[in-house]
């Protein structure tokens, strides 16, 4: 997957640090204090559509299978630059009944951008 | 997630058979001769735009807590309607050595979709 | 401690709108979802919607689709439920309570609620 | 959207004896992302059991949760006197975020 810089724009990833403490939650995370968390930006061309980042996933190839032959309905859907690898990461929290735990957070980080 | 039903044009999940005869995969790919794929399609008003189904990803909640103060650069960011869960499926095909492989293969069918 | 510290009760005819406070005290304001459960008189509980007070954004129970307005003001650590048009099935009990709504992370019980405000609709 | 249906409407019992309140969902609560409230006449609502089975900050331990995907029940072990009240199971795992109809602990 393109790690975003500035002279393409082109479907990226693009770094982003998200600080806890900015969007209030740092009175029940207790660590880590906040995340790169990323996101994807970038235009998705119809001859990049289902690219998803290094590799296809097997649904996204075959869509663009009927996409690319101008199949209805697909080849009116559009292209998102969207995450298709996300990464968990250990987290350190209050939970509802103010237990400390300690858990792998799914899809927190994104690691890939595609096209969908 | 919701399921498209002709009634709304809310980012829903479409059903949608594949023939892996249509796309010429059939000399490769034993069994099934097909499978319900499903596809996403819909709007993205902003005001769903980060909800992933009935629950957001922990990347998503994020974003969309930037996204939805108008926050610089998540504000533009176009929302898209995208498969937000995806379901492995077993298939029986002949690999490159033409040997007959048995294998759950990832993210094979949608299961849910939502704004990314 | 936590605190959520709703207005007073209210008397209002059909057809006027309500709007009901709820002090936060105690925790991040903008760290938490803000929910409005109401309770009619020997009834059960109902949701209403909730609001996110960092970004403000809003889900509305159907139900309450377009009478409905979910607002906040950081500054002050305060949501409002403004309910319009209201008829005599509005009466209740309006309840706001926090949560945070993240999946992901297995959280979004209610875990204090406000002391309630009545509505009174009646001509 | 998730319906949640509780059973019994009312259930008598006596102080000491064990009280069993069940909550069916509609379609699966994934997760476990099902609460139990207790609510006691003028009093809001208080949270109880979260995730299922996981007790609240100062909830006694007499109180427990049980149960996955469509049916969960609450169990009293015990009944105090002050356990006498309405008990609601709500899910939060989608929205629109349902309540149960509510089951009503009464003394016999």
């Known amino acids: 997957g393109l790690e975003c810089d500035g002279k393409v724009n082109i479907c990226c990833k693009k770094q982003f640090f998200v600080s806890f403490k900015d969007i209030g939650w740092n009175d029940w995370i207790i660590a880590p204090s906040g995340y790169h968390a990323n996101y994807c930006e970038g235009e998705c061309p119809s001859h990049i559509a289902g690219t998803s980042g290094s590799s296809l996933s097997f649904h996204s190839t075959v869509i663009n299978h009927y996409r690319m032959r101008g199949h209805s309905p697909f080849a009116n859907l559009k292209s998102c630059c969207v995450p298709t690898k996300l990464r968990p990461m250990s987290m350190l929290y209050y939970d509802d009944g103010q237990n400390i735990i300690k858990k792998d957070i799914q899809n927190m980080i994104v690691e890939e951008c595609g096209c969908s | 997630g919701l399921e498209c039903d002709g009634k709304v044009n809310i980012c829903c999940k479409k059903q949608f058979f594949v023939s892996f005869k249509d796309i010429g995969w059939n000399d490769w790919i034993i069994a099934p001769s097909g499978y319900h794929a499903n596809y996403c399609e819909g709007e993205c008003p902003s005001h769903i735009a980060g909800t992933s189904g009935s629950s957001l990803s922990f990347h998503s909640t994020v974003i969309n807590h930037y996204r939805m103060r108008g926050h610089s650069p998540f504000a533009n960011l176009k929302s898209c309607c995208v498969p937000t869960k995806l379901r492995p499926m077993s298939m029986l095909y002949y690999d490159d050595g033409q040997n007959i492989i048995k294998k759950d293969i990832q993210n094979m069918i949608v299961e849910e979709c939502g704004c990314s | 401690q936590v605190q959520l510290v709703q207005s007073g009760a209210e008397v209002k005819k059909p057809g006027a709108s309500v709007k009901v406070s709820c002090k936060a005290s105690g925790y991040t304001f903008h760290g938490y979802n803000m929910h409005w459960v109401r309770q009619a008189p020997g009834q059960g509980l109902e949701w209403m919607g909730s609001?996110?007070?960092?970004?403000?954004?809003?889900i509305y129970a159907q139900k309450f689709q377009g009478r409905v307005t979910m607002t906040r003001d950081t500054s002050i650590s305060t949501a409002y439920m403004e309910l319009s048009r209201l008829r005599s099935d509005d009466t209740a009990v309006y309840y706001c309570?926090?949560?945070?709504?993240?999946?992901?992370?297995?959280?979004?019980?209610?875990?204090?609620w406000g002391q309630g405000t009545l509505v009174t609709v009646s001509s | 959207e998730i319906v949640l249906t509780q059973s019994p409407g009312t259930l008598s019992l006596s102080p000491g004896e064990r009280a069993t309140l069940s909550c069916r969902a509609s379609q699966s609560v994934r997760s476990s992302y099902l609460a139990w409230y207790q609510q006691k006449p003028g009093q809001a609502p208080r949270l109880l059991i979260y995730g299922a089975s996981s007790r609240a900050t100062g909830i006694p331990d007499r109180f427990s949760g049980s149960g996955s995907g469509t049916d969960f029940t609450l169990t009293i072990s015990r009944l105090e006197p002050e356990d006498f009240a309405v008990y609601y199971c709500q899910q939060y795992v989608s929205y629109p975020r349902t309540f149960g109809g509510g089951t009503k602990v009464e003394i016999k």
């Open positions: 309570a926090r949560a945070r709504d993240i999946a992901a992370a297995g959280l979004g019980a209610f875990d204090y």
């Open positions: 609001i996110n007070p960092y970004s403000g954004y809003t």
